[in-house]
């Protein structure tokens, strides 16, 4: 399928001009290659009429140009002084020959319609209203006023001043006079449809002395706006229907042959195909609203329409706006798993893509909620603190410049299952949707912290150990201190990895963290985790409470979070040999690092990018202090 996109049908009238925009994928080659506009002949040959190389055919001389807009990845063909001879089939395309990538465009140029000389032309969009002005002489002031629509032989009454109204105009047509002007009456017709288009006659009075006026009403379907979007990216339909429908329910639908199937409306209807990846947002009191769809699929391409009606469904004679969405499969957005699987008590690491050209943009992670119009409250962001209910179990790690940031969520419960969005304050196309599935755990956790009852005593030494299975033998292990700005990694030593024995003793695999002496600032959440290079895997969390020394004090666990962390995990969750296609929650890059490491990253491979947020939280970077040293048992 060609990735070139443009208008399928263009219509105009003789003497007018057209402007045709064609879109191409965002690549350097495409930006610089030849662009062309050619006319298709009966033989299938396509004869160049104009190209970006400077060629201009004789029949286009002095009336056409082609302009490339590389910053928009579009080129525009402008043609003036149209004649009926310009009607035909064309291609806009890219390449050194006219057999390159292209898009078919049909151009129809029709004759200017012949109208009576005194005809007043009104041009209105479907669903809108028109007010027709009907002047008359003073002597006809007391007489009957009327508007009729011309049919083949007669003129069919629309409305008159004696309250006679054609049934098809009841509730839509009003005849009135303004102010003290006794020489004009008006007819307003609302909820215009294609059937309303045609010639009308205004009349005041009867017989030969009657005042008459010819009116031509043109009712136009809105031109679809072209939207060119990459696969897996997002699109926003900005719908501005006007103040007159501000209080009506709004909808977005997709054309399906003759009908338009509602995808979402403000009454709570939502197509299941868009679950987790769509929001409808009222913008203001003037009837403006937008619909955002993320995680675009190739089957999302098509003709969309937004509108307003109390039913929340498309209704003839109500204002609409339309779009033609093209989904370019040559996407710059990396193909990531759209489903991540975890188990209760376990953890997931989610890699979120962003536009690498916008490394300084703010990164966010939000949870999609489908109630009402749908919304996505931010749970964590590079400059947004973690939401309270996610304390100790959620962190976002930015890796400037590599096009990925990582979100880790641990202590999973079944309530965490749902849809999440990766988004930035930069290029909105790079919004992606992840579905998190959480199954009940069926086996022991891979990572287990002892003691479970983690209460440290002020001024004393306190050690916690993180036990891991032999399958993590070759992976790096770490401890980090969580804050709502990230998880600051602490230097540690791994006893298991130092053993020279080839065999793996299940009971002796542990990595320990010692606080010596314990201070009040040490209280908080700590994570133990494993990683392979820059790919972060499973984590488990523990809350360490700090108490003052008291005689015979019994340590009470301040939270049930440690109990949660004990729930069993499926071993496969961190098996890095599993292929992406299985949609397991295999480890994703999680750039825990401290500040000193960050400065040396430079332009290494993207997995090695590390985050200032992850390790530079004020008051957290105490890893060099003698109070935090890590040893083995």
């Amino acid at each position: 399928k060609s990735p070139i996109f443009g208008p399928q049908e263009v219509s105009s009238i003789e003497g007018d001009s057209v402007s045709i925009t064609c879109y191409y994928p965002d690549t350097s080659v495409n930006r610089h290659t030849r662009k062309y506009w050619c006319r298709q002949g009966a033989s299938g040959m396509c004869t160049t009429l104009i190209s970006s190389n400077g060629y201009l055919s004789k029949e286009y001389s002095g009336r056409a140009n082609l302009i490339n807009f590389p910053e928009n990845n579009t080129f525009v063909i402008n043609i003036e002084q149209l004649t009926q001879d310009d009607t035909g089939s064309y291609k806009c395309g890219l390449g050194t020959s006219n057999r390159g990538l292209s898009f078919d465009v049909s151009l129809e140029v029709s004759q200017v319609p012949e109208l009576p000389s005194d005809t007043h032309v009104y041009t209105k969009d479907i669903g809108r209203n028109v007010t027709i002005e009907c002047p008359f002489k003073r002597e006809n002031a007391p007489s009957k006023k009327s508007l009729c629509k011309k049919t083949n032989q007669s003129c069919e009454l629309v409305i008159d001043s004696t309250e006679k109204v054609n049934p098809s105009y009841i509730g839509r047509a009003k005849l009135f006079m303004k102010g003290t002007d006794l020489t004009v009456f008006y007819v307003n017709i609302s909820h215009l449809t294609h059937n309303d288009a045609g010639l009308y006659i205004c009349q005041a009075g009867e017989g030969p002395s009657a005042d008459k006026k010819n009116v031509d009403l043109q009712v136009l379907a809105p031109e679809p706006e072209l939207l060119y979007k990459d696969l897996r990216s997002s699109v926003t339909f900005e719908c501005d229907l006007g103040r007159e429908v501000a209080n009506e329910a709004k909808y977005l639908c997709r054309m399906n042959k003759e009908t338009c199937d509602v995808i979402i409306n403000t009454l709570g209807k939502r197509d299941p195909d868009f679950e987790g990846r769509i929001l409808i947002t009222p913008k203001d009191d003037n009837g403006r609203f937008s619909v955002l769809i993320t995680g675009l699929r190739k089957e999302d391409a098509g003709h969309y329409q937004c509108g307003a009606h109390s039913s929340g469904l498309p209704q003839e004679g109500w204002p609409i706006q339309t779009w033609q969405l093209f989904v370019n499969e040559e996407s710059t957005i990396p193909n990531r798993r759209s489903v991540v699987k975890g188990v209760t008590g376990g953890s997931v690491a989610i890699a979120c893509p962003y536009n690498p050209k916008e490394s300084s943009s703010l990164k966010y992670w939000c949870r999609w909620e489908g109630d009402g119009n749908g919304h996505c409250p931010v749970l964590v962001g590079t400059q947004a603190q973690v939401q309270e209910e996610y304390e100790g179990r959620l962190a976002l790690f930015d890796q400037p410049g590599n096009g990925t940031y990582t979100v880790i969520l641990n202590q999973l419960t079944t309530e965490d299952a749902g849809f999440y969005w990766c988004l930035t304050n930069g290029d909105s196309r790079w919004r992606t949707t992840i579905e998190l599935q959480v199954a009940e755990a069926t086996r022991e956790p891979n990572l287990e912290v002892t003691p479970q009852n983690a209460t440290a005593v002020l001024g004393e030494t306190f050690t916690v150990s993180c036990h891991y299975p032999c399958k993590f033998y070759s992976q790096e292990k770490y401890w980090c201190k969580w804050s709502n700005k990230g998880c600051h990694i602490l230097p540690s030593h791994d006893e298991g990895a130092r053993q020279s024995s080839v065999s793996c003793d299940q009971s002796s695999q542990l990595v320990s963290m010692t606080l010596n002496p314990v201070s009040k600032e040490d209280e908080g959440w700590y994570w133990c985790g494993v990683k392979q290079g820059q790919t972060y895997g499973e984590t488990t969390a523990i809350y360490i409470a700090v108490e003052e020394r008291t005689r015979g004090s019994s340590h009470v666990n301040p939270t049930d979070a440690n109990a949660r962390a004990k729930v069993a995990l499926e071993e496969e969750v961190v098996d890095s040999s599993i292929s992406e296609k299985e949609n397991k929650a295999i480890p994703n890059p999680g750039p825990f690092a401290n500040e000193r490491e960050i400065q040396n990253v430079g332009d290494q491979a993207q997995e090695n990018r590390a985050s200032g947020d992850a390790g530079s939280a004020d008051g957290q970077s105490r890893s060099s202090s003698s109070k935090h040293h890590h040893h083995h048992h």
Epitope: A141, P142, S143, K144, K145, I159, D160, S161, T162, E163, K164, V165, Y169, I170, G171, A173, K174, L175, F176, M177, K178, G179, T180, L182
Partner: nanobody
């Protein structure tokens, strides 16, 4: 603006007659239709009759057809309602209403934008 004032209400025996009058003032050239409505205690306001100002046409509720007549006097800017063969169920407050547009729906009270204060009609049996 258009101002409307009703007169002619009162007590009448069943079978008798009354003539109500509605005097319009202000920007009366914009008035397209004038109607009479009535409201009995505890009941909805209901349409009685209407007359168009530009090209004379009259409309009546089924319940008063043949008994009531609506007419206009353009020179005096008045609209009258002649009520004959009165019945006890005709007793109500009668309102004169005007609207500045025609739409083919002349019998809905919420389509009228100007209203008088009303005049009481009582019918004794």
């Amino acid at each position: 603006q258009v101002q409307l004032v009703e007169s002619g209400g009162g007590l009448q025996q069943a079978g008798g007659s009354l003539r109500l009058s509605c005097a319009a003032s202000g920007r009366t050239v914009t008035v397209m239709t004038v109607g009479w409505f009535r409201q009995a205690p505890g009941k909805e306001r209901e349409f009685v009759a209407a007359i168009t100002m530009y090209g004379e046409r009259t409309y009546y509720a089924d319940s008063v057809k043949g008994r009531f007549t609506i007419s206009r006097d353009n020179a005096k800017n008045t609209v009258d309602l002649q009520m004959n063969s009165l019945k006890p169920e005709d007793a109500a407050v009668y309102y004169c209403a005007a609207r500045t547009y025609v739409s083919g729906i002349y019998d809905r009270f919420d389509d009228y934008n100007y209203w008088g204060q009303g005049t009481q009609v009582t019918v004794s049996s």
